[in-house]
């Protein structure tokens, strides 16, 4: 059945922590991606920027859990409203933002 | 235009080794993910293993012992070399090429023929 | 590793009429609510082309007369209705742990 919203984020949260921690060369050779409005549908529009990296292993887990916590299809070069078009950071970065939102969110009890 | 073609000896004795070089055109090495794949004669296909673009590498089990794959991004190819090799190696070897997520075989070389045989 | 169990080895469809091809895992292909299994098909001659992908999704430019689906252990590839040009041996992959793996193959012939 579908994974309880707040397993889905502690699991997220230990996966993006699991990166930042073993990370040694740059995250994904230092691929750029879409920066994104951390707010409500936040799942499909992380997803929507990551899907548009590819051949990266430190974040297939990422990419998966994502595509399975959003409930509609993702493909690349799909863009939301949630996008900050005009700004491009590092995978690195990116997750590190991510992370931070998401521990936030956890404390707070929000988990949808 | 994203292109993969494959290059080998042909012919390999038997408890020789196996070198295949797999080169690509229309993408970068750095941020792709490629498979190598075996087809004997009049059989199904069998993964063996494959190289991601940030350099992590999978292996088949059963063969795990036997294979190693390593790539040059800057030469823009991709090596298979496989040991000990045995007549049931004898196959066609393909390259492919994975998509983006969730990283199916999206684009495939035309294959190499090897026959191992004395 | 998963193994993937495909029947039949083999079938002949008439023209127009509807294949259907199955796909069995020794484990759950499932991660995060996707299935992780996709379908290839492959001409004689030739190396293997993507059909579908995640068990259902059509892949670009292919017909819609194929169709996939299935969940956890038990997938199925439909081609319906068959045509001349889809005479062909038709795979099925997981990706679900990083050793992947093939199934046998299951060869399609046009009556």
């Known amino acids: 059945g579908p994974v309880p919203p707040s397993t889905a984020l502690r699991e997220l949260i230990e996966e993006l922590v699991n990166i930042t921690q073993n990370q040694k060369a740059p995250l994904c050779n230092g691929s750029m991606v879409w920066s994104i409005n951390l707010t409500a549908g936040m799942y499909c529009a992380a997803l929507e920027s990551l899907i548009n990296v590819s051949g990266c292993s430190a974040i297939e887990k990422t990419q998966r859990m994502l595509s399975g916590f959003c409930p509609h299809k993702v493909s690349a070069g799909q863009f939301s409203s949630l996008h900050v078009r005009d700004t491009k950071i590092e995978v690195a970065q990116f997750v590190k933002d991510l992370l931070l939102h998401l521990k936030k969110l956890f404390r707070e009890g929000q988990f949808n | 235009e994203v292109q993969l073609k494959e290059s080998g000896p042909g012919l390999v004795a038997p408890g020789g080794s196996l070198s295949i070089t797999c080169t690509v055109s229309?993408?970068?090495?750095?941020?792709?993910?490629i498979n190598w794949v075996r087809q004997p004669p009049g059989k199904g296909l069998e993964w063996l293993g494959m190289?991601?673009?940030?350099?992590?590498?999978d292996y088949a089990d059963a063969l795990k012992s036997r294979l190693s794959i390593s790539k040059d991004s800057s030469k823009s190819q991709v090596f298979l070399e496989m040991t000990s090799l045995r007549t049931d190696d004898t196959a066609t070897y393909y390259c492919?090429?994975?998509?983006?997520?969730?990283?199916?075989?999206?684009?495939w070389g035309q294959g190499t023929s090897v026959t191992v045989s004395s | 590793d998963i193994v993937l169990t495909q029947s039949p080895a083999s079938l002949a469809v008439s023209l127009g009429q509807r294949a259907t091809i199955s796909c069995r895992a020794s484990?759950?292909?499932?991660?995060?609510?996707?299935?992780?299994m996709h379908w290839y098909q492959q001409k004689a001659g030739q190396p293997p082309k993507l059909l579908i992908y995640?068990?259902?999704n059509l892949e670009s430019g292919v017909p819609a007369r194929f169709s996939g689906s299935g969940s956890r252990t038990d997938f199925t590839l439909t081609i319906d209705p068959v045509q001349a040009e889809d005479a062909a041996t038709y795979y099925c992959?997981?990706?679900?742990?990083?050793?992947?793996?093939f199934g046998g193959g299951t060869k399609l012939e046009i009556k």
């Open positions: 492919a090429r994975d998509g983006r997520f969730p990283y199916a075989m999206k684009f």
């Open positions: 229309g993408f970068s090495l750095t941020d792709s993910s």
């Open positions: 190289i991601w673009g940030d350099g992590r590498i």
């Open positions: 484990e759950s292909v499932d991660s995060y609510g996707q299935s992780y």
């Open positions: 995640l068990a259902s």
């Open positions: 992959q997981q990706n679900a742990e990083d050793s992947r793996t």
